[in-house]
């Protein structure tokens, strides 16, 4: 028969042959050959491959270095990497995330639109017209000003996006 | 500082019960396995088994099953080795200690001597 | 059960020597871990995945091997070298170590 040019999936071609891939949590020790299936070998401790493969040796898994501000969300197995995470209050770099970074404060005149995760950073947007922010925050919205009518107070200094309006008492020498 | 800090040492007669704590600092206990190996007096090291202390899953040299119980307390990032129906083979020095990652190549602790003996 | 038997059991060597040892497993492993260990002291990983130094480790040890032999090479012997080595396997439970080998001062 003709030799094949191409394999099935979770095949791979070598000396004119298809030989079963590696399944994940394991390497590949030796090519099928026409009388011998393909020889696999499971990945040991610390070790992982993720993918049908031809690898001849695992990776090794990713270590979650607390020095840059990283933890362990999932410990890896013979199937998959560790997956790290950011500490309390910081947020990966990258996709990857191989470090991490202190969650942005919103500034006076913006609030939080977003609180910031392990993967994603804070998203401030400013405080929209009847709306405040007068700290440095990494949780706090845009809170709206006081309605002084419904505390049958009157506005004596109006609001910005940076302050709360300041309510006063009603003049009483109106008719 | 990382440590594994293990209790101090225990003199049992024989078909008594020892427990062993393996106190962790410095990193999260659940984000290894905790490995107990024993080591007799000029001999070599033996592997009796290991917890994933975020499940409580072990996995425990045949040597030993039966005889040996592994623990862990996440809330206070300590774990346990317990071995039952002691005998004058298992005078040794038992160590605890962790898988490692490339960054961190395992940690051990300072190691527990138990004496059995009548 | 994989038994790992490690060949010599000690041996004597003088300080600049090549010193070999090796680590035989009964069926494909892996890898292999290198461990010393000085007297009444607990053992530190010394070579991981093989052929990996651990951190703090001269570039005078070296490690190499696949399937069923490993081996361990000083290349050049130093006084703080003298100890006992172990590999372990940590592919099959139950992991296994080889019976040690101690290295002494000729």
């Known amino acids: 028969p003709e030799p094949p040019t191409a394999c099935r999936e979770k095949q791979y071609l070598i000396n004119s042959q298809c030989c079963s891939l590696c399944q994940p949590g394991q390497k590949l020790v030796s090519d099928c050959t026409e009388f011998t299936e393909t020889e696999c070998l499971p990945c040991g401790e610390s070790e992982f491959l993720d993918t049908w493969n031809r690898e001849t040796h695992c990776h090794q898994h990713k270590y979650c270095d607390p020095n840059l501000g990283l933890r362990v969300q999932q410990k890896g197995t013979s199937e998959t990497d560790t997956i790290c995470t950011c500490e309390e209050g910081w947020h990966c770099t990258s996709e990857a995330c191989e470090s991490c970074v202190l969650h942005r404060s919103c500034s006076p005149g913006f609030g939080v639109k977003q609180i910031a995760t392990g993967v994603s950073d804070t998203i401030c947007e400013p405080c929209p017209v009847g709306f405040f922010s007068n700290v440095s925050s990494a949780f706090e919205k845009c809170h709206p000003w006081t309605s002084c009518e419904t505390k049958d107070l009157v506005v004596q200094q109006a609001g910005t996006n940076k302050t709360d309006v300041v309510c006063g008492p009603q003049d009483r020498l109106r008719a | 500082e990382v440590q594994l800090v293990q209790s101090g040492a225990e003199v049992k007669k024989p078909g008594a019960t020892v427990k062993i704590s393996c106190k962790v600092s410095?990193?999260?206990?659940?984000?290894?396995?905790i490995h107990w190996v024993k080591q007799r007096p000029g001999k070599g090291l033996e592997w009796m088994g290991r917890i994933d202390p975020e499940d409580g899953d072990t996995k425990y040299d045949p040597k030993f099953q039966g005889r040996v119980t592994m623990t862990a307390d996440t809330s206070t990032d300590t774990a346990y080795m317990e071995l039952s129906s002691l005998r004058s083979e298992d005078t040794a020095v038992y160590y605890c200690?962790?898988?490692?990652?490339?960054?961190?190549?395992?940690?051990w602790g300072q190691g527990t001597t138990v004496t059995v003996s009548s | 059960q994989i038994q790992m038997t490690q060949s010599p059991s000690s041996l004597s060597a003088s300080v600049g020597d090549r010193v070999t040892i090796t680590c035989s497993a009964t069926?494909?492993?892996?890898?292999i871990l290198w461990f010393q260990q000085k007297p009444g002291k607990a053992p530190k990983l010394w070579i991981y995945?093989?052929?990996n130094l651990a951190s703090g480790v001269p570039a005078r040890f070296s490690g190499s091997g696949s399937g069923t032999d490993f081996t361990l090479t000083i290349s050049s012997l130093q006084p703080e070298d003298f100890a006992t080595y172990y590999c372990q396997q940590r592919t099959f439970y139950p992991y296994t170590f080889g019976g040690g080998t101690k290295v002494e001062i000729k």
């Open positions: 995945s093989t052929s």
């Open positions: 410095g990193f999260n206990i659940k984000d290894y396995y």
């Open positions: 200690t962790t898988s490692y990652y490339v960054g961190t190549y395992g940690y």
């Open positions: 069926s494909s492993v892996s890898y």
